[in-house]
């Protein structure tokens, strides 16, 4: 699977995860989160050749396509597969509040 | 939805079902198929700025992240989101067989 | 396209209750909460508070609890505000709005309704 | 209750640039959206979280939000751009969310 144990631990061109910080405040203008400051985000990156972690018959078909048709603009994309949520704390008034934000974290990507 | 009946009929710039045709022989290589000569696969394309059909919670916050950080190599991907089966007809010896290939034709697509 | 659609303009006497629906299409009904925001005529815009589609959960803004009433029905994407104890004071544009996040209390509406007008007079 | 404080007119030139003020004690410290509303039409997101655009928007419109003032920016402006603006922000002590009083603009 291309997820954080392997991608993280390797140079790998292809599709990947790949570390992504995100600063509340400074990247997302969100001022309403008392804890985390900011989490790992992670992204996904990397070009889709053919056989690799391709998601579906149709993906496997586009990315043979593009190798009969080199340059074509249709081709897979690199995108999230498995996504984890966030805990956060924030609060109303004085009173704080526990949150999970669902499909907050990439942890593996695939070629859809 | 970013469906063929919005996409084929606007001049959408942004993600959005794009028309594709595909040759079975030319474009993939594959001969065992006897009808249909080819088919309409589609594919997805466009950008995927802020607030367009933004598949998860993730995705919005990388679009949002994207905003504040324009140039980060981090975005959203339009990719597939409706998929439907092909009928194609092919020869086992002289013996035509009737099979459905799933998930070959792209109907509409997200940011993801 | 995502749209949400109001019912029709209302006339009401003093006293009486108004029940304006916003029939949602384009995206899933349940994976956004719904708001709802008022316009008196000539004046700015006031929330009232929202639903989360997904669990029928509410928050309704201090001013209006006890008299707003915030409902939906899943199986036809349609959230509904009921307004009761109406006064001439309630005269107003009510208009339904997507919030473009999930969880988030700072959020704000990306895709609003056309509006409502409901009049109170006796 | 958190109280948004906009001015109630302000009148610009074609071509030059406009800016509408949003006061609010703090309000560098919470997250605000910009609202356009046209007449007789339902209000439209210009600004995000103090500064992102939704598609669509031009990139003519900008925001800042630091200390007490958050300003709305609207670089060379079109009759179009005549509208009512609106500030919003979520007010954490009452957990209501709340709109700034407008600010008509004006193309002259």
């Known amino acids: 699977a291309l997820d954080t144990n392997y991608c993280f631990s390797s140079t790998e061109k292809n599709c990947c995860v790949r570390q992504l910080y995100i600063d509340f405040r400074k990247d997302l203008g969100w001022k309403w989160i008392h804890e985390p400051k900011g989490y790992h985000a992670n992204f996904c990156l990397g070009p889709c050749p053919y056989i690799w972690s391709l998601d579906t018959q149709y993906s496997k078909v586009l990315a043979l396509y593009n190798q009969h048709n080199p340059g074509a603009s249709a081709a897979p994309c690199c995108v999230p597969q498995a996504l984890e949520p966030l805990p956060i704390v924030y609060y109303v008034g004085r009173k704080p509040k526990v949150e999970q934000l669902s499909n907050m974290i990439v942890r593996s990507c695939k070629c859809s | 939805a970013l469906d063929t009946n919005y996409c084929f009929s606007s001049t959408e710039k942004n993600c959005c079902v794009r028309q594709l045709y595909i040759d079975f022989r030319k474009d993939l290589g594959w001969k065992w198929i006897h009808e249909p000569k080819g088919y309409h696969a589609n594919f997805c394309l466009g950008p995927c700025p802020y607030i367009w059909s933004l598949d998860t919670q993730y995705s919005k916050v990388l679009a949002l992240y994207n905003q504040h950080n324009p140039g980060a190599s981090a975005a959203p991907c339009c990719v597939p989101q409706a998929l439907e089966p092909l009928p194609i007809v092919y020869y086992v010896g002289r013996k035509p067989k009737v099979e459905q290939l799933s998930n070959m034709i792209v109907r509409s697509c997200k940011c993801s | 396209q995502v749209q949400l659609v109001q019912s029709g303009a209302e006339v009401k006497k003093p006293g009486a209750s108004v029940k304006v629906s916003c029939k949602a299409s384009?995206?899933?009904?349940?994976?956004?909460?719904m708001h709802w925001v008022r316009q008196a005529p000539g004046q700015g815009l006031e929330w009232m508070g929202w639903?989360?589609?997904?669990?029928?959960?509410?928050n309704y803004a201090q001013k209006f609890q006890g008299r707003v009433t915030m409902t939906r029905d899943t199986s036809i994407s349609t959230a509904y505000m009921e307004l009761s104890r109406l006064r001439s004071d309630d005269t107003a544009v009510y208009y339904c709005?997507?919030?473009?996040?999930?969880?988030?209390?700072?959020?704000?509406?990306?895709?609003w309704g056309q509006g409502t007008m409901v009049t109170v007079s006796s | 209750s958190y109280v948004l404080t906009q001015p109630p007119s302000v009148s610009v030139a074609p071509g030059k640039t406009a800016r509408i003020t949003c006061g609010g004690n703090?309000?560098?410290?919470?997250?605000v959206h910009w609202y356009q509303q046209k007449s007789g039409q339902a209000p439209v997101l210009v600004i995000y979280?103090?500064?992102a655009r939704p598609s669509g928007i031009p990139e003519r419109f900008s925001a800042s939000n630091s200390e007490n003032t958050a300003t709305l920016t609207i670089r060379r402006v079109e009759a179009g751009d005549e509208a009512d603006y609106y500030c919003?922000?979520?007010?954490?002590?009452?957990?209501?969310?709340?709109f700034g009083g407008g600010t008509q603009l004006t193309v002259l």
């Open positions: 709005a997507r919030s473009f996040l999930w969880l988030v209390p700072s959020d704000a509406f990306d895709i």
């Open positions: 384009g995206y899933t009904f349940t994976g956004y909460y």
């Open positions: 639903i989360n589609p997904n669990t029928g959960g509410t």
């Open positions: 703090n309000i560098g410290f919470r997250s």
């Open positions: 979280f103090d500064r």
């Open positions: 919003q922000v979520w007010d954490s002590d009452s957990d209501d969310l709340v």
